[in-house]
């Protein structure tokens, strides 16, 4: 089933999705939609990129990572319970007929009334391994034979341990770099 990601009401939620461009600037269109990935494209589109830039977005939805390097992870600002549900990240590889599509489940929890604990800084312990969307084991890279200039890293999830959005925010804030592929 879909990997679950969690955030609290009022926080920013983080839904990871990545691919590896063949070269900097050689981008692949990506869409994000609310709801499971349809047969084609994305339904209820909240954000879309083209070969150059983010060309469509709606309020509260943005890409915080470097999408020019293939980090098309979605940030949803100031979430409410209504933001719970499935989100579709679709990497629209040109020239072949099978887009990479990933369904990610966002669970919004009511805000805690107790003070937040000290922020986690030991990312080695918190982030011991990568996961792939299909299959098991280390991150796998699929080279698309019909499109030799694109390497698609089949990763839509960072790790089981990275399902709480606060930890994702910590990881991003720390400037830690995750090499994929």
């Amino acid at each position: 089933s879909e990997v679950e990601y969690r955030a609290e009401v009022g926080q920013n939620a983080y839904l990871p999705c990545f691919y590896t461009p063949a070269a900097p600037g050689n981008l692949v269109p990506v869409c994000w939609g609310k709801g499971a990935c349809p047969v084609f494209e994305c339904g209820n589109v909240v954000l879309r990129t083209d070969e150059r830039d983010v060309n469509y977005w709606t309020s509260r939805y943005w890409l915080n990572g470097d999408f020019r390097k293939g980090d098309v992870s979605l940030t949803i600002e100031n979430v409410t319970l209504a933001d719970s549900g499935i989100y579709c990240c679709r990497i629209q590889i040109p020239g072949i007929m099978n887009d990479e599509k990933f369904n990610l489940k966002l669970v919004i929890k009511p805000a805690k009334v107790t003070p937040a604990p000290t922020r986690q800084r030991d990312f080695t312990a918190a982030f011991p391994r990568m996961l792939t969307t299909r299959g098991h084991g280390p991150a796998e890279t699929q080279t698309l034979g019909s499109l030799p200039d694109i390497n698609l890293t089949q990763i839509s999830t960072l790790a089981n341990e990275l399902r709480d959005s606060r930890l994702a925010n910590d990881l991003r804030d720390s400037g830690a770099t995750i090499r994929i592929g």
Partner: antibody, heavy 114, light 107 residues
């Protein structure tokens, strides 16, 4: 609501070319994806291919050398052409669209026979 | 192509009863499964998408479940209008492929 209606001949001779039309109301074929699916007498359903908002097409590899899907945006119609038909192409042909193939025409039944 | 093996090919059940139809994909289709009802003279009707999401306007007597390669479809409290042929569809990979169909009859 999107409505689709197939039209075309009910009988075609072997080796001839089949041409079908799908007339669309309630949406513009300059948006979304427009598909053809057929159902054989034994109840098997086969996905044939699509034409999308930009005019890009995909054809099922099993039909690739014989199939063509085109469109006329001014008429809001799209078309299926199948060359060199045989009796194996006897089927009911449906035009289909929607996020999860929500909208289907009623189908047009084609018999290939000499 | 991803072959979809659907069973049974036909079944007969009592009004008010329950039926289950299964589809097995040759490979993991990541829950990208739809279920359709087909009656003669009409186009197929979408019942369920993404394995278990009920299409708008479809009664809750219909349900779906599954993951990986194995998927199932249930009808509870069978009614006369449920007489039809039912199909699964995988839309994870092109060319999309359908199950072989299950013809449902009421006893």
């Amino acid at each position: 609501e999107v409505q689709l209606q197939e039209s075309g001949p009910s009988l075609v001779k072997p080796s001839q070319t089949l041409s079908l039309t799908c007339s669309v109301t309630g949406d513009s074929i300059a948006s979304a994806y427009w598909n053809w699916i057929r159902k054989f007498p034994g109840n098997k359903l086969e996905y044939m291919g699509y034409i999308n908002y930009s005019g890009s097409t995909y054809y099922n590899p099993s039909l690739k050398s014989r199939i063509s899907i085109t469109r006329d945006t001014s008429q809001n119609q799209y078309y299926l052409q199948l060359n060199s038909v045989t009796t194996e192409d006897t089927a009911t042909y449906y035009c289909v669209t929607g996020d999860y193939f929500d909208y289907w025409g009623r189908g047009t039944t084609l018999t290939v026979s000499s | 192509d991803i072959q979809m093996t659907q069973s049974p090919s036909s079944l007969s059940a009592y009004l008010g009863g329950k039926v289950t139809i299964t589809c097995k994909a040759r490979q993991d289709v990541r829950k990208n499964i739809g279920w359709y009802q087909h009656k003669p003279g009409k186009g197929p009707r979408l019942l369920i998408w993404y394995t278990s999401t009920l299409q708008s306007g479809i009664p809750s007597r219909f349900s779906g479940s599954g993951s990986g390669r194995d998927y199932s479809f249930n009808i509870n409290n069978l009614e006369p209008e449920d007489i039809a042929t039912y199909y699964c569809l995988q839309y994870d990979n092109l060319p999309f492929t359908f199950g072989t169909g299950t013809k449902l009859e009421i006893r």
